[in-house]
């Protein structure tokens, strides 16, 4: 009778084991072990027992002891069970961002590991077990579906293998995959709201505001604002679940025309975009041209108004005839025209909006000097000793210099309050002088003496 010890062994992969083959007869013709494993026979006294060191055991194996005794041949098997933890425990790659409300399939793959009967695969969220299944197949695959919730944000999912050899007197061997950190997000189906000027003038600045509500986590949202190829640099203000991105946009003549203004919000692996067109236009103020800004009375003056080729102008409220970018008027300069404003108003239609620009020029008319009865009376009669203010206003542009002298030397104090005396009486020659010429006028002052009864 052949016997083997131990009859069952559990050993780590690549390990060694001592196996003893024994026979019940004293002088066996043959005693050995049948195995393809590398073996080393340990020398022992006696013929009925042999000890072998079997090494580099990579797989389960069943070495067989055999002996040949006078009463016949017999065999006995030992069962070697190899254990080893999996070589690979891996969660199938997933996008780190997952939209709330989506079903997320977690797939764990396990390569290797033995004995499979003692190997379990566990899917976890943090420390909470989601699924536990025996490892079946090569690679073993365990899947579970998770409905993504907002509170899963930042949660770590992992896969763990448990090789439980405690029933065999060994320990529980655990292997854990690299964790998968879930980033959950909510990006509403509504596009962002974009507030901006529909038209923008060259060499000016406009303000663009892009906003969106109902985002989670709002701090992770990326906002891209651009006008054509020009990336804008917004200042972003965050609310609980909203943001507002404000940016200044400057445009130059190169940008003229219709440009696309885009606001894109990127969150997770999704994006929402709003497009708007902005018309960049160039519209200089109209030009008011006077033949000469300063003319002498009676001169013919041409006033021209010129604006953008597509504009329509009115000059002093009178539309151009025909309606267009140019208008003009002719006038003979009179003193009343001095300081007269000529206003040109130009209107340009840009993307359905009417843009208005104005320009005003003032005409200076040189005239005079003038001394007339109304403003410089030729005769004053004042009671003696009364308080009077002699008035004489000379008109003209430029304003004339006025002097009133009696006998070429005695001045009449124009515009000053004086006490009337006999000395004031007489005829004065008032002379108004400017670059335009000179005029004179006689002014007589009569003094009434009081009657003494």
């Amino acid at each position: 009778q052949t016997s083997v010890s131990p009859s069952k062994v559990i050993l780590p992969r690549g390990g060694s084991v001592l196996v003893t083959c024994s026979t019940s007869c004293d002088q066996p013709k043959l005693l050995g072990i049948e195995t393809p494993l590398p073996k080393k026979e340990l020398l022992l006294p006696g013929n009925n027992r042999k000890v072998y060191e079997l090494s580099n055991v990579q797989e389960d194996s069943q070495p067989m002891c055999y002996s040949n005794c006078p009463d016949g041949q017999s065999t006995a098997k030992t069962f070697l069970t190899v254990y080893w933890t999996p070589e690979r425990v891996e969660l199938a790659p997933l996008p780190s961002w997952q939209p709330v409300g989506k079903n997320l399939t977690l797939r764990c793959q396990v390569e290797g590991g033995a004995p499979r009967a003692n190997l379990t695969v566990v899917l976890l969220r943090g420390e909470k077990e989601l699924k536990r299944e025996p490892a079946v197949g090569e690679p073993a695959e365990v899947t579970t579906t998770v409905l993504v919730r907002r509170d899963h944000h930042g949660a770590n999912f992992s896969c763990r293998t448990e090789l439980d050899l405690r029933p065999q007197g060994l320990e529980l061997f655990e292997n854990t995959s690299a964790p998968y950190q879930l980033q959950t997000f909510v990006l509403p189906a509504t596009p962002p709201q974009l507030v901006s000027p529909r038209v923008l003038e060259v060499d000016t600045q406009g303000t663009v505001v892009c906003s969106l509500d109902g985002l989670f986590p709002v701090s992770e949202a990326q906002v891209h604002l651009a006008l054509g190829d020009q990336r804008l640099n917004p200042t972003v203000t965050y609310g609980n679940d909203s943001f507002s991105a404000k940016a200044s946009v400057s445009v130059t003549a190169e940008d003229e025309g219709t440009q696309r203004l885009t606001c894109a919000v990127i969150l997770g692996n999704q994006s929402q975009e709003t497009l708007q067109t902005v018309t960049i236009y160039s519209f200089p103020a109209p030009n008011v041209i006077l033949t000469k800004p300063e003319v002498s009375e009676g001169t013919e003056v041409t006033v021209k108004c010129e604006a953008h080729p597509r504009a329509k102008v009115t000059l002093n409220g009178v539309p151009a005839q025909p309606l267009g970018p140019r208008a003009q008027l002719l006038l003979k300069a009179t003193p009343e025209d001095n300081g007269r404003s000529f206003s040109c108003s130009a209107t340009l239609e840009v993307a359905g909006q009417l843009i208005h620009k104005n320009q005003t020029r003032e005409l200076r008319v040189l005239y005079g000097p003038r001394l007339d009865e109304r403003d410089c009376p030729g005769n004053w009669t004042w009671p003696e000793n009364s308080q009077q203010t002699p008035m004489c206003q000379a008109w003209g542009n430029p304003l004339p210099e006025l002097k009133c002298l009696k006998d070429g030397t005695f001045p009449l104090p124009i515009g000053e309050s004086v006490t009337v005396t006999r000395d004031l009486e007489g005829t004065y020659l008032c002379r108004a002088r400017s670059t335009q010429g000179e005029v004179t006028r006689k002014v007589t002052v009569n003094v009434l003496s009081p009657r003494y009864e």
């Epitope: 043959l30 050995g32 072990i33 049948e34 195995t35 393809p36 494993l37 590398p38 073996k39 026979e41 990579q58 797989e59 389960d60 194996s61 069943q62 067989m64 055999y66 098997k77 069962f79 070697l80």
Partner: antibody, heavy 116, light 107 residues
Framework: QVQLVQSGGGLVQPGGSLRLSCAAS????????MHWVRQATGKGLEWVSA???????YYPGSVKGRFTISRDNAKNSLYLQMNSLRAEDTAVYYC??????????WGQGTMVTVSS | DIVMTQTPSSLSVSVGDRVTITCRAS??????LNWYQQKPGKAPKLLIY???TLQSGVPSRFSGSGSGTDFTLTISSLQPEDFATYYC?????????FGQGTKVEIK
């Protein structure tokens, strides 16, 4: 009677594959370790692979990673899948039963020629 | 790997002669030594296993001896059907290795 009958040899190009079969009869196939041995023309015998009763497999360095030994106890059959074949794999291949640590029963042999 | 060295590689003998073939292992293999006979175009045939045990059906003129590293196959009286090539093989360790063979030819 106890015998091993082989099939599956032939001519194959370098880099090609071939599968040899060995059908056992007359004994309890599942109770024995099985081996493949080859012999190049005019040369000696060379051990190629072994499979234990538990399905454990063994190979020399010259064929490891290219050859795969397997057994189907239900069909009393032994197989040798040979991939990435080289000219130096040209030989007569024998399957053999191992009993009492010796190859006591041999198949008739099958010729494998690797040549372009 | 255990290297098996057989001597001689060939020998010419006559029917009835005693033939001795030796086999040396590069390390101790206890009694895990087998002898095979192969005729041209045929599969090898097991003659002796465990260094000295005669395989069932093999004539008693064949015998084996030795243990450890040195082993001998003896054919006490060569018969015409014994002209063949003889191989020793160790089954102590994997890979299983064979001697290079000894060709026994008719003188």
């Amino acid at each position: 009677q106890v015998q091993l009958v082989q099939s599956g040899g032939g001519l194959v190009q370098p880099g090609g594959s071939l599968r040899l079969s060995c059908a056992a009869s007359g004994f309890t196939f599942s109770s024995y370790d099985m081996h493949w041995v080859r012999q190049a023309t005019g040369k000696g015998l060379e051990w190629v692979s072994a499979i234990g009763t538990a399905g454990d497999t063994y190979y020399p360095g010259s064929v490891k990673g290219r050859f795969t030994i397997s057994r189907d106890n239900a069909k009393n059959s032994l197989y040798l899948q040979m991939n990435s074949l080289r000219a130096e794999d040209t030989a007569v291949y024998y399957c053999a039963r191992s009993a009492l640590s010796a190859f006591d029963i041999w198949g008739q042999g099958t010729m494998v020629t690797v040549s372009s | 790997d255990i290297v098996m060295t057989q001597t001689p590689s060939s020998l010419s003998v006559s029917v009835g002669d005693r033939v001795t073939i030796t086999c040396r292992a590069s390390q101790s293999i206890s009694s895990y030594l087998n002898w095979y006979q192969q005729k041209p175009g045929k599969a090898p045939k097991l003659l002796i296993y465990a260094a000295s045990t005669l395989q069932s059906g093999v004539p008693s003129r064949f015998s084996g001896s030795g243990s450890g590293t040195d082993f001998t196959l003896t054919i006490s009286s060569l018969q015409p059907e014994d002209f063949a090539t003889y191989y020793c093989q160790q089954s102590y360790s994997t890979p299983r290795t064979f001697g290079q063979g000894t060709k026994v030819e008719i003188k």
